[in-house]
Interface confidence: low
């Protein structure tokens, strides 16, 4: 009598989540009589998947009619596969007995479930950073299988390389998660920039998933301040202008101080956007020189996006020769400056 063979022709089968998996098994002989059972895993902890003899297995059906005596095909079909179904499946021949006695196991078929990664979610820094600072963006995607996955970062279409990526868990699992951090150096022209996290996986058929984040959420472009004085008018009024340029976001408060006392406070709103996404704002103050006996110290104080205020100051000198003044005098570009204007 020839030895019984239990043949599982496929070492592995890969199925997309939601599809059905067919696990093939044939036997070389119908003797001895006894059932075929399918298990996931081996050893004492194995899980019964299907017993062709009895039981209720709603997701599992026999490919051929197991009740026919001459049937040697004990293949099964598992419907609506999920990542939790991954594992090695064994077709096992039993000899009828009390209890049934295991005679022979097939070599096993490994079922891997191709599960699509979830849409990548990109999160940026909790607080804004200024140009020339490096900020981190994180991208997460979950629930994919197999473990092999490719994640790339792009900034304005250009691939980033300062990236750290981890796929968890390290060992075998029904599904995996990926987490990647990209470090991006901000520049002043990044208000309109975008970072994209692109995830490629075998389940996506060459059409990667993308998650995006706008650098406008992460960047703060501090303003440049310039204070200028126009020519004195015939009515002895001096027009002093504070130009606040190239800032982002728009949240900005400007306060004029005359000799340390608040003269006027304005909030920026509905400003037109520069081509690079930043904003400019100009505020002016009319100072009546003839109404003052002493010098007037003017300060343009700008509070941008909750940051410490930046001041530009200069003194308007009350002069016996008002017509000698320059037509357009500017304060320095940085720091707190005082300029005597005649």
């Amino acid at each position: 009598e020839e030895e019984l063979q239990v043949i599982q022709p496929e070492k592995s089968v890969s199925v997309a989540a939601g599809d059905s998996a067919t696990l093939n098994c044939t036997v070389s002989s119908l003797i001895p009589v006894g059932p075929i059972q399918w298990f996931r895993g081996a050893g004492p902890g194995r899980e019964l998947i299907y017993n062709l003899k009895e039981g209720h297995f709603p997701r599992v059906t026999a490919v051929s009619d197991p009740t026919k005596r001459n049937n040697m095909d004990f293949s099964i079909r598992i419907s609506n596969i999920t990542p939790a179904d991954a594992g090695t499946y064994y077709c096992v021949k039993f000899r009828k007995g009390s209890p049934d006695v295991e005679l022979k196991s097939g070599a096993g078929t490994e079922l891997s479930v191709r599960a699509k990664p979830s849409a990548p979610v990109v999160s940026g820094p909790a607080v804004r950073a200024t140009a020339e600072h490096t900020v981190s963006f994180t991208c997460e995607s979950h629930g994919f299988s197999p473990r092999d996955i490719t994640l790339k970062w792009f900034k304005n279409g250009n691939e980033l390389s300062d990236v750290q990526t981890n796929v968890d868990p390290a060992g075998k699992s029904v599904s995996y998660s990926i987490r990647s951090t990209a470090r991006v150096l901000l520049t002043r022209r990044d208000v309109h920039s975008q970072v994209i996290c692109e995830v490629a996986h075998v389940t996506l058929q060459g059409d990667p998933l993308r998650g995006t984040a706008n650098l406008s959420e992460a960047i703060r472009v501090p303003p440049f301040l310039e204070v200028t004085q126009q020519s004195m008018r015939a009515d002895n009024q001096v027009n002093v202008t504070c130009q606040v340029t190239k800032f982002y976001p728009q949240r900005l408060q400007l306060t004029w101080l005359e000799n340390g006392n608040v003269s006027r406070t304005e909030m920026a709103s509905a400003l037109p956007e520069n081509k690079d996404g930043t904003y400019n704002w100009t505020s002016w103050l009319l100072v009546n020189v003839s109404a003052h006996r002493d010098d007037v110290k003017l300060t343009c104080q700008v509070e941008h996006d909750g940051q410490p205020a930046v001041n530009k100051s200069f003194s308007v000198k009350v002069s016996a020769h008002p017509k000698e003044q320059g037509s357009n005098t500017a304060a320095e570009n940085t720091g707190t400056n005082e300029r005597n204007i005649y």
Epitope: E132, N158, R183
Partner: antibody, heavy 118, light 107 residues
């Protein structure tokens, strides 16, 4: 003083290789986009390659697959590895710094001459 | 690739003249246009960036203007040291491209 000094140029046969170096001083090279620009004898300027602050690299079509731009932060140096050189690659090669705000070229090296001839 | 077309390719002028060189981009480049000056045997020198901003140390007789596709470089009063070749460049997207150059000669 901010300065870029190129080296490594010379005479090489067609099909040969050269590695150009650019030593930066007065600033941290890794904080800037850096470029190579070349100028064939009697001709205009041609942008060749760039490396971004994140290590991203870019090339003009005629050198893709033959030239490799890189930098070594520890040495504050930029490199251009040129393989499979052709006569058309004969030029003065300039190392150029891109500005912080918008990558506008601001600092140029003095250039190094590469001659590809048999 | 974005093409940058400079005109004229050569220009004769006298000391004290005001000259204008134009550059046209094959597609809109916002204001990411730059101008360079090059003298024979020397490396180029950066003059103007973002169409109209002067690099540090560049005299104010040089000015630039334009946005989109059309850009100009103007030298208000030519001095002997200004006779050189001038190049425009777009740096809005890779590959960055230069104009073919304008050679400014003494009349």
């Amino acid at each position: 003083e901010v300065q870029l000094v190129e080296s490594g140029g010379g005479l090489v046969q067609p099909g040969g290789s050269l590695r150009l170096s650019c030593a930066a001083s007065g600033f941290t090279l890794s904080s800037y986009d850096m470029h190579w620009v070349r100028q064939a004898p009697g001709k205009g300027l041609e942008w060749v390659s760039a490396i971004g602050t994140a290590g991203d690299t870019y090339y003009t079509g005629s050198v893709k697959g033959r030239f490799t731009i890189s930098r070594e932060n520890a040495k504050n140096s930029l490199y251009l590895q040129m393989n499979s050189l052709r006569a058309a690659d004969t030029a003065v090669y300039y190392c150029v710094r891109g500005g912080v705000w918008d990558d506008a070229f601001d600092i140029w090296g003095q250039g190094t001459m590469v001659t590809v001839s048999s | 690739d974005i093409q940058m077309t400079q005109s004229p390719s050569s220009l004769s002028a006298s000391v004290g003249d005001r000259v204008t060189i134009t550059c046209r981009a094959s597609q809109g480049i916002n204001n990411y246009a730059a101008w360079f000056q090059q003298k024979p045997g020397k490396a180029p020198k950066s003059l103007i960036y973002t169409a109209s901003s002067l690099h540090s140390g560049v005299p104010s007789k040089f000015s630039g203007s334009g946005s989109g596709t059309d850009f100009t470089l103007t030298i208000s009063s030519l001095q002997p040291e200004d006779f050189a070749t001038y190049y425009c460049q777009q740096y809005v997207s890779y590959p960055y491209t230069f104009g073919q150059g304008t050679k400014l000669e003494i009349k």
